[in-house]
C-alpha cells in the first residue's frame, strides 16, 4: 500500500523534476520501503513496500531496494532472513567459527588440556594446558579442565594420584592406616591435587587452537598428537598435576583432534591459571575409576587459573 | 628438587634493555608453562608474561605488551624475558614461576631502571 | 587497582584463627579456581593452596581454602609466629584474559 504519511519522518531528499528540471525537496521514504513516485510541487513522493528478496534499513529516496544477499552457503545458517528492512545475515553454526569467509569447525582441546576461552561464530576456542590439580579425560571444544577428585575430602584415599589427564581414583580409607597413599597434599588453587603425580614429557605438542599465533588457517583438523611421544613414569613429586597416568606407554597414531587453529587459544598463565580455571567444582564420588580417553600426551602446563 | 634460578638482572637507563634468564631443573621443563611475574619494592605481586611449555603461545600483561617478549629453550631447559624501552615503573624483582598454578617459583632478580 | 581485593592487613595471636578475604567478580573468581601463595620476609611467593582449597604436600593443614560465588578466603588455624607473612590469592580473568593477584595481605602474629 502506498505511503504518503511524512508525519514521523524528518528526512528530505533532493529530486530534480525531469519536467520542469526544478529541484525539488522530499520527504524521505522509511525503511522497508522506496521510492515509487518523488514529489512534485503539488504532490507528496509515494513510498511502497520493498518487493520480496530487497530491503532498505534506513529511511531512503532511492528509487529501488536493495537486493538481499545470496542464500547463505553451507554450512553457514540464516542469523537474519532477508526481509523489508534487513538482509540475509549468514553466520557460522554452533561448533564452528568464521575464518577467512568460511565456517571452520571450533578446536577440540586435546587430552590434558581445557577450553581457556569458549569459541564463538567468530572466533575459536582457546585452548590451555591443564595446570596442577587439574584435568582432562577427554577431547572437548566446549570443557574446561576439572579439578581432581578430592578423595581425602570425602575421608578416603587416594589410590591413584590423577594427572593432568586422568583423575584421581579415590579407594576405603583404612582406619587402621594412618598413612594415606600419595594423598595430594596441597591443591595449588582449587582442588585436590595431583601432589605426587607424573611429570610426563609431552612433547612440544600444542593444540593449534591454543597458539597464539597470528596464523589464520581455516584447516578442518587440528591438534595432532606426535606418534611419537612416550610418556615418562618418573614421578615428578613437584608436580601435583603436571603428568599423565604413570604407565609408560607410547601414543599409539594419536588421534587428531579436529579443530581449528586461530590465533586464539591462549591458555597461560591464567593466572597461574590452569589450576586457577574452572570454578566448577566438581562433586567428587567415592570411589573414581579414570576416564580414559584417548591415550593423549599430556601436552604442556600453563597458568590456568580458568575454571569449569 | 624442582630449581628455577633467576639472573640477568641489574641497573639500567629508561629506554634501556634487559634480558632475564631463568635456569631450570628438577623437572622436565618442556612439559610445562612458564610465567614471569614482577614485584616492584613494598609492592604486591604482577603477573607479566607466561608462555606455553613448547613456545608456540605467549600471553602478556597490558602494561609491558609491545616492550617485553618472553621465550624459551627447552633444549637448555631456560626461561628468557626480554625487555626492551624500559621504565621506572619497570623496577621490580622478577620471579619465574612453573606451571598455570605457578607451584614453583625462583628467588627472583631485581631490576632497576633509574637514571 | 587490583582486580581481586583483599584487605591490607591481619593479625592475630599464636593459636588464634584468622582468615583472609579475596573478593572478586563473576569474570575471574566466579568463574575460575583460586590460588593462595605464602610469601615470608624477603623470600620468594609459595603456592599455599591451589584448586580453591587443595595444599600441596608440605603445607600444614592448619592452612585451608575455600570459594564461594565470587569471593575466596584463606584461613589460618593455630596461628604460628611462622604464618607471619604477605598472603597473596590469585586468579585467572576471562574478561582480561590474564591472570590477575590480589593486592596482598600481611598477617602479623601478635
Known amino acids: 500500500q502506498p505511503e504518503q504519511k511524512t508525519l514521523s519522518l524528518t528526512g528530505t531528499y533532493r529530486h530534480v523534476d525531469r519536467t520542469t528540471g526544478q529541484v525539488l525537496t522530499c520527504d524521505k521514504c522509511p525503511a522497508g520501503t522506496y521510492v515509487s513516485e518523488h514529489c512534485t510541487n503539488t504532490s507528496l513522493r509515494v513510498c511502497s513496500s520493498c518487493p520480496s528478496g530487497t530491503f532498505t534499513r534506513h529511511e531512503n529516496g532511492i528509487e529501488r531496494c536493495h537486493d538481499c544477499s545470496q542464500p547463505c552457503p553451507r554450512p553457514m545458517i540464516e542469523r537474519l532472513p532477508c526481509a523489508a528492512l534487513t538482509d540475509r545475515e549468514c553466520i557460522c553454526p554452533p561448533g564452528m567459527y568464521q575464518s577467512n569467509g568460511t565456517c571452520a569447525p571450533h578446536t577440540v582441546c586435546p587430552v590434558g588440556w581445557g577450553v581457556r576461552k569458549k569459541g564463538t561464530e567468530n572466533e575459536d576456542v582457546r585452548c590451555k594446558q591443564c595446570a596442577r590439580g587439574t584435568f582432562s579425560d577427554v577431547p572437548s571444544s566446549v570443557m574446561k579442565c576439572r579439578a581432581h577428585t578430592d578423595c581425602l575430602g570425602q575421608n578416603l584415599m587416594v589410590v591413584k594420584q590423577g594427572t593432568k589427564e586422568t583423575d584421581n581414583v579415590c579407594g576405603v580409607h583404612l582406619s587402621s592406616s594412618s598413612t594415606t597413599p600419595s594423598s595430594p597434599g596441597i591443591a595449588t588453587f582449587s582442588h585436590p591435587e595431583h601432589t605426587e603425580s607424573h611429570d610426563v614429557p609431552s612433547s612440544t605438542y600444542e593444540p593449534q587452537g591454543m597458539n597464539s599465533t597470528d596464523s589464520n588457517s581455516t584447516a578442518s583438523v587440528r591438534t595432532k598428537v606426535p606418534s611419537d611421544i612416550q610418556e615418562e613414569t618418573v614421578p615428578d613429586n613437584t608436580s601435583s598435576t603436571s603428568g599423565k597416568e604413570s604407565t609408560n606407554r607410547t601414543l599409539p597414531n594419536p588421534p587428531q583432534l579436529t579443530h581449528q587453529q586461530g590465533p586464539h587459544h591462549r591458555h597461560i598463565l591464567k593466572l597461574l591459571p590452569s589450576s586457577m580455571e574452572a570454578t566448577g567444582e566438581k562433586s567428587s564420588t567415592a570411589i573414581k575409576a579414570p576416564k580414559r580417553g584417548h591415550p593423549r600426551q599430556n601436552p604442556h602446563k600453563h597458568f590456568d587459573i580458568n575454571e569449569h | 628438587e624442582v630449581q628455577l634460578l633467576e639472573s640477568g638482572g641489574g641497573l639500567v637507563q629508561p629506554g634501556g634493555s634487559l634480558r632475564l634468564s631463568c635456569a631450570a631443573s628438577?623437572?622436565?621443563?618442556?612439559?610445562?608453562?612458564m610465567s614471569w611475574v614482577r614485584q616492584a619494592p613494598g609492592k604486591g605481586l604482577e603477573w607479566v608474561s607466561s608462555i606455553y611449555s613448547s613456545g608456540g603461545e605467549t600471553l602478556y600483561a597490558d602494561s609491558v605488551k609491545g616492550r617485553f617478549t618472553i621465550s624459551r629453550d627447552n633444549s637448555k631447559n631456560t626461561l628468557y624475558l626480554q625487555m626492551n624501552s624500559l621504565r621506572a615503573e619497570d623496577t621490580a624483582v622478577y620471579y619465574c614461576a612453573r606451571d598455570g598454578a605457578a607451584d614453583y617459583w625462583g628467588q627472583g632478580t631485581l631490576v632497576t631502571v633509574s637514571s | 587497582q587490583s582486580e581481586l581485593t583483599q584487605p591490607p592487613s591481619a593479625s592475630g595471636t599464636p593459636g588464634q584463627w584468622v582468615t583472609i578475604s579475596c573478593s572478586g567478580s563473576t569474570s575471574n573468581i566466579g568463574n575460575n579456581y583460586v590460588y593462595w601463595y605464602q610469601q615470608l620476609p624477603g623470600t620468594a611467593p609459595k603456592l599455599l593452596i591451589y584448586t580453591n582449597n587443595q595444599r600441596p604436600s608440605g603445607v600444614p593443614d592448619r592452612f585451608s581454602g575455600s570459594k564461594s560465588g565470587t569471593s575466596a578466603s584463606l584461613a589460618i588455624s593455630g596461628l604460628r609466629s611462622e604464618d607471619e607473612a604477605d598472603y597473596y590469592c590469585a586468579t585467572w580473568d576471562d574478561s582480561l584474559y590474564a591472570p590477575v593477584f590480589g593486592g596482598g595481605t600481611k598477617v602479623t602474629v601478635l
Open positions: 628438577g623437572f622436565t621443563f618442556s612439559n610445562y608453562e
